[in-house]
């Protein structure tokens, strides 16, 4: 590490003075930073002398030496008062400039130690300083200003007490940059547009800074805008505002808009969709199936997606039948606007009931006209079964009838014994009845089918069952003979 | 309607000034630039300069800045040019233009013709 | 500043027939930003103010008849009015809107016989 003759860590010196300062190191050793005209500087072997015959307070200030040969890197310092009576600053800087929460040295150097105890910091010509400035004070360095505020960027001076009056130093402007975080915030309105040719429109950009110095810019497709731009400063931020106000829109006038706001910390945009029309519009879809099919018992949510420009005066949900004159119950319908220019109207329709089942229709209306989309809803039921014993033209004939929706497909089994229901290990027989008659299908009603099974004598001790099923589910009846007859065969199939 | 309104017509001595106004209507007047346009007895049109109407940035052709003075007052949607130290040669027809967005002349005042005479 | 020359100064046509009329600027005037021209033509009747006729070189204002049609690019553009009424009598100005000053042309004056 350098040493530096004489020792310091401080000197005092009068105007007028020869000083020497030696830096003497195992190598060779420089002096850091400019060196100020009133110096000489020579070398004398591993040392470097640095020596004015005139010192004045301008050489008041830290002079450090270094060896740069010196793998650890050492210095050596001292600091250098030159106490001159009418001098008491020697200020290194005019202009400061930090950014915002950073500490701010304001390098004016005291030329007499003494002096320390009645030095202080003020704004240009006296002016205290604002509240909530906390600073401190070093002789070497001068005085920082903690964590300075944009507010704290002005002009200062530092003062001392020099038999009784206070001597100021020629001021310092202390420039207080605000942090851009990033790019200007921005806000682009509408999100979309929909006009009506001839129509007015209006589309607004505005930027919001926390410094004056950015620029906005509204763009159709690739066209920059030539726009008037609004100032204005509020919430601590700076804003600029450009409004695009159209008297009657053209088709020329749709297409794609972004506004564009760039600082030094980059660029930012956002876009959005200008439509003209030529004509209000109503369309009315739907995501799901038109025609719709649902267990009894079960909830179905009945949902139409609505787009138009101008808006909905009117909309509704209405039973068209075939059952009841009810109408669904306003609670149950539902409608969301997931933008500007599109909604979602949705009807519940929980626990369905059998006279719920028919002609659903969502109806709209705008200056575009009504619309309608109606919905077909028919309840699905498990078969419901039923059989007798009957004769048809002097034959024995058992008759199965089989009622829900789906249309029910019918099996005849014949089991052993006596039983409500043949299960697997007593079947005997199995007959299935490829076409069944159809006695009854409506719309939004079960299909009702009928199955005929002819016997002249059913035998005794066995059981016949009718089994009928579809996608809901099944149902069966078994009919147990009274008495036994002569074994038949049943008919072809 | 949109509509620019001009004052009438101005008869001025040599040296004086004068301040001709144009009152829009029919639209915002503080979303357009305006522009001045002069036209000497029938001959080619002339680009004065135009202004914002928020905050009174001018930007003037070099050939007449220190002669037109652009000024705006927003409250009554009404723009104006002073003209200063007229000569016979600012004799002409001033015409007051809004900049369309997307930056042609798209609606043009009547115009207001001056003479420079003793 | 950009000079806009037109030529010819002036033409007289009966009506029926097809006229072009030229305009050229000292530079270009394609707009890099969106590939337009900055270029736009008025119409001045007398004792009006001009009217605007067609911008960006080729686009035709709302409300002007299909029989004005605009062309060029770069430096060298066009106004042909396919089939001349008695009302087009008027002088024709072009204008670059490519960059201040804006300048106009020197106008052509069109007659009818």
């Known amino acids: 590490i350098p040493v530096i003759e004489p020792s310091g860590p401080e000197l005092v010196v009068k105007p007028g003075e020869t000083v020497t300062l030696r830096c003497v190191g195992n190598g060779s050793v420089e002096w850091d930073g400019p060196i100020s005209p009133h110096w000489t500087l020579y070398s004398d072997g591993p040392s470097s002398v640095l020596t004015t015959n005139n010192a004045t307070f301008q050489n008041t200030r830290t002079y450090r030496c270094t060896e740069p040969g010196d793998p650890l890197g050492g210095s050596a310092a001292i600091h250098l008062y030159v106490k001159d009576p009418a001098r008491p600053w020697n200020v290194l800087a005019k202009e400061v400039v930090v950014f915002e929460d950073q500490d701010a040295l304001l390098p004016c150097l005291l030329t007499d130690p003494v002096l320390e105890a009645g030095v202080s910091l003020v704004r240009l010509r006296g002016r205290p300083l604002l509240r909530h400035t906390n600073y401190s004070f070093s002789p070497w360095h001068g005085f920082i200003i903690h964590r300075a505020k944009f507010i704290q960027g002005q002009d200062y001076q530092c003062s001392a007490l020099m038999g009784g009056r206070k001597v100021m130093s020629i001021s310092i402007r202390l420039k207080v940059q605000k942090v851009i975080p990033g790019p200007p915030a921005l806000t682009l309105v509408p999100a979309e547009l929909v006009r009506i040719r001839g129509e007015a429109a209006q589309i607004v950009c505005s930027a919001s800074n926390i410094d004056v110095d950015f620029d906005v810019f509204l763009q159709h497709n690739t066209t920059k805008l030539a726009i008037p731009q609004r100032s204005d400063f509020h919430d601590n931020r700076y804003q600029k505002v450009l409004t695009l106000s159209l008297g009657q829109v053209d088709f020329q006038h749709a297409g794609n808009y972004s506004c564009v706001a760039s600082n030094v910390q980059g660029k930012h945009s956002t876009s959005m969709f200008f439509q003209v029309v030529e004509s209000a519009y109503l369309d009315l879809s739907s995501e799901q199936n038109l025609i719709q099919e649902v267990t009894v018992g079960e909830g179905l949510n009945l949902k139409v997606m609505v787009e138009a420009y101008p808006g909905l005066q009117g909309f509704n949900w209405t039973y068209l039948g075939p059952f009841s004159d009810h109408q669904p119950e306003p609670k149950l319908a539902n409608a969301t606007t997931k933008d500007t220019y599109r909604h979602t109207f949705t009807l519940s329709l929980p626990r369905l009931k059998p006279s719920e089942a028919g002609r659903y229709s969502f109806l709209a209306r705008n200056p575009g006209g009504w619309r309608a989309l109606t919905f077909e809803l028919t309840l699905r039921y498990p078969p419901e079964v039923s059989v007798i014993w009957t004769s048809i033209n002097g034959s024995g004939t058992l008759l199965c009838a089989a009622s829900g929706y789906p249309q029910p497909n019918v099996t005849w089994l014949q089991c052993a014994g006596h039983t409500d229901r043949c299960d697997e290990a007593q079947v005997l027989q199995v007959w299935v009845d490829p076409h069944p008659e159809v006695l009854s299908q409506e719309p939004f009603q079960k299909v009702t089918v009928q199955s005929l099974l002819t016997a002249e004598t059913l035998e005794h001790n066995q059981t016949y069952e009718c089994r009928a099923h579809n996608s809901v589910g099944s149902g069966s009846w078994a009919f147990i003979p009274i008495s036994a007859g002569a074994r038949t065969h049943p008919p072809d199939e | 309607e949109v509509q620019l309104q001009q004052s009438g017509p101005e008869l001025v001595k040599p040296g004086a000034s004068v301040k001709i106004s144009c009152k829009a209507s029919g639209y915002t007047f503080s979303n357009y630039y305006m522009n001045w346009v002069n036209q000497r007895h029938g001959e080619r049109l002339e680009w004065i300069g135009e202004m914002n109407p928020n905050n009174g940035d001018s930007s003037y052709n070099q050939k007449f800045k220190g002669k037109a003075t652009l000024t705006v007052d927003k409250s009554s949607s009404t723009a104006y040019m002073e003209l200063r130290s007229l000569t016979s040669e600012d004799s002409a027809v001033y015409y007051c233009?809004?900049?369309?967005?997307?930056?042609?002349?798209?609606?043009w005042g009547p115009g207001t013709t001056v003479i420079v005479s003793s | 500043d950009i000079v806009m020359t037109q030529s010819p100064s002036s033409l007289t046509v009966t009506a029926g027939e097809k006229v072009t009329m030229s305009c050229k600027s000292s530079q270009s005037l394609l707009n890099s930003g969106n590939q337009k021209n900055s270029l736009t033509w008025y119409q001045q009747k007398p004792g009006q103010p001009p009217k605007l006729l067609i911008y960006w070189a080729s686009t035709r204002e709302s409300g002007v008849p299909d029989r004005f049609t605009g062309s060029g690019s770069g430096t060298d553009f066009t106004l042909t009015i396919s089939s001349v009424q008695t009302e087009d009598l008027a002088v024709y100005y072009c204008q670059n809107d490519y960059t201040y000053p804006f300048t106009f042309g020197t106008g052509t004056k069109l007659e009818i016989k």
């Open positions: 233009a809004r900049r369309s967005p997307w930056w042609f002349f798209d609606v």
